[in-house]
């Protein structure tokens, strides 16, 4: 996702350092502070149907929010994929699709977006209280994954009740990636700054631009190893019913489309429904950062019960292997 | 030397069922998904379908989803494709292909089993 | 479906010349395609997968290019080996589906 902040103005130093350090030295630190309040997290979104007319039948919708290139989405359902879940689905941007039954069709919507239609017959149809998951891997994000589900009414004409639903996860490769260069370099700015400022660096505070606008946060050293360490994992509860959209969505906007960034505004073609269902006005929406905010003692200002946080137990090379199907 | 055996050519009555074989020698079966791909004489190829020898799951073109039958036998790293009701429709050669994950294409066939339907 | 068209049935060449196969895939596919050599009395094997990229042990006379809906298998350098059926194949999105095949002959 991109995230915006309003940074305050920051004096050069003077120019006694100017001449101390050298001024290679201090092309870094304001390449780094760049680097630092640009850089984004990246965000899973999951929407999990039921068809009103085939009530067995399920579409799950899965978009990724993030600047970098998606390499590979997989679809699973049962739990996360590698963590006890089946594949249904591995979607690659240039290279295509393989798909497992119940799945019968699943596409690219758009760039960052993608569709799985599932049948309702046979025994391997998906049962009502099934999770589903979609992980994206992405360069130079890392892999990123969010699920959702649908509970246990079939009844179109009943709203079931909340069930515990999406769940965003951020493995630690991209975290430990570039990221980690960006953390080291944020730390050392830091160091330097407070070294030759004979000053505490400038704290940078988080600020909204506008109602739907993420929230930044900078991160002082001590959350940021703490961010590198901890993958967060982040539970909120959902309702759903058939014919209803349930997200997993960085943002409580008022439709589906119009609460995309930018780069994936433009409407993918599919059925008009879609996209003019609204999402329901408690729309939470999940986000990596809230772990990050958890990590620093604050509530997260928009997850709902039952915020959990761990790492994921497979570590930094779980996308490493062969696409596809392993 | 990654090898993929299919079982011998089959002479089959109409309405009735066969089950060819593909046994996988070379590499770790479960590593890769099974395709199976029909040739009728002298037409094209035809994408039956595709089974993940790790869990079971499936693949089926629609258009033969009531035809065909997937499975595998992971003790023997035997791929296995039931067909049923027959017809001379069915009378083809049929091809076991390995589905390589890395690079995204077919990259070793068998030899092929040719199915005749005749009564 | 997504149809893959190969307009030429036939096509007649020379050993030293250069021919090229065309398929042209009713929709989008990216450069998810493949092309697949079938010799007379063989099965198919793998000559070009994902557009451009050459399968193990495929000499380099054999190249690929294109992507979205227009693909091109060039053999230049033809020998009489290569006299066989031509087939491409698209992976985008499933049920996969062939092209109808081409032929080469050797005059």
């Known amino acids: 996702m991109r995230t915006e902040a309003q940074v305050p103005a920051l004096q050069p130093p003077e120019p006694g350092l100017e001449g101390a350090m050298g001024h290679r030295t201090l092309v870094l630190p304001w390449v780094l502070l760049t680097l630092c309040v640009t850089a984004g997290t990246p965000e899973v979104w999951v929407q999990v149907r039921m068809e009103a007319t085939e009530l067995s039948s399920f579409t799950i919708r899965c978009g990724f929010l993030g600047s970098g290139s998606i390499s590979l989405v997989t679809v699973s359902w049962g739990g996360p994929n590698g963590a006890g879940g089946t594949t249904l689905a591995v979607l690659h941007p240039e290279r295509g699709i393989r798909q497992w039954a119940p799945a019968r069709q699943a596409r690219w919507e758009t760039q960052s977006s993608i569709s799985l239609i599932l049948e309702g017959s046979g025994a391997s149809s998906p049962c009502a209280n099934t999770t589903f998951c979609c992980k994206f891997a992405s360069f130079p994000e890392g892999s990123w994954e969010a699920c959702g589900s649908l509970p246990p009414s079939s009844d179109p004409g009943l709203s079931a009740p909340p069930t515990p639903a999406p769940i965003l996860r951020a493995d630690l490769a991209g975290i430990l990636g570039v990221s980690g260069v960006l953390l080291f370099g944020c730390v050392y700015l830091l160091h330097l700054l407070r070294r030759h400022k004979h000053r505490p660096a400038p704290r940078l505070q988080p600020s909204r631009t506008s109602p739907q606008a993420p929230r930044a946060r900078a991160w002082a050293p001590s959350q940021a190893s703490q961010a590198a360490l901890h993958v967060p994992y982040a539970t909120i509860n959902t309702s759903c019913r058939p014919a209803t959209l349930d997200t997993a969505h960085p943002h409580g906007g008022p439709s589906w489309w119009a609460s995309l960034p930018t780069h994936a505004a433009h409407r993918p073609q599919g059925p008009a429904a879609w996209a003019s269902t609204p999402i329901p006005a408690r729309g939470s929406f999940v986000s990596v950062e809230n772990g990050l905010y958890a990590q620093a003692g604050e509530r997260p200002p928009h997850t709902g019960p039952g915020l959990t946080l761990f790492p994921d137990p497979r570590g930094p090379r779980a996308m490493e292997g062969p696409l596809g199907v392993r | 030397e990654v090898q993929l055996q299919q079982s011998g050519p089959e002479l089959v009555k109409p309405g009735s069922s066969v089950k060819i074989s593909c046994k996988a020698s070379g590499y770790t079966f479960t590593d890769y998904n099974i395709d199976w791909v029909k040739q009728s004489h002298g037409k094209s190829l035809e994408w039956i379908g595709a089974i993940d020898p790790n869990n079971g799951g499936t693949n089926y073109n629609q258009k033969f989803k009531d035809k065909a039958t997937l499975t595998v036998d992971k003790s023997s790293s035997t791929a296995y494709m039931e067909l049923r009701s027959l017809t001379s429709e069915d009378s083809a050669v049929y091809y076991c292909?390995?589905?390589?994950?890395?690079?995204?294409?077919?990259?070793?066939w068998a030899t092929g089993t040719t199915v005749t339907v005749s009564s | 479906d997504i149809v893959m068209t190969q307009s030429q049935k036939f096509m007649s060449t020379s050993v030293g010349d250069r021919v090229s196969i065309t398929c042209k895939a009713s929709q989008n596919v990216r450069i998810a395609v493949d092309w697949y050599q079938q010799k007379p009395g063989q099965s198919p094997k793998a000559l070009i997968f994902s557009s451009s990229n050459r399968h193990t042990g495929v000499p380099d006379r054999f190249t690929g290019s294109g992507s979205g809906s227009d693909f091109t298998l060039t053999i230049r350098n033809v020998q009489s080996e290569d006299l066989a059926d031509y087939f491409c194949l698209q992976h985008w999105i499933s049920p996969y589906t062939f092209g109808g095949g081409t032929k080469l002959e050797i005059r």
């Open positions: 292909t390995r589905w390589d994950s890395n690079d995204w294409y077919f990259d070793v």
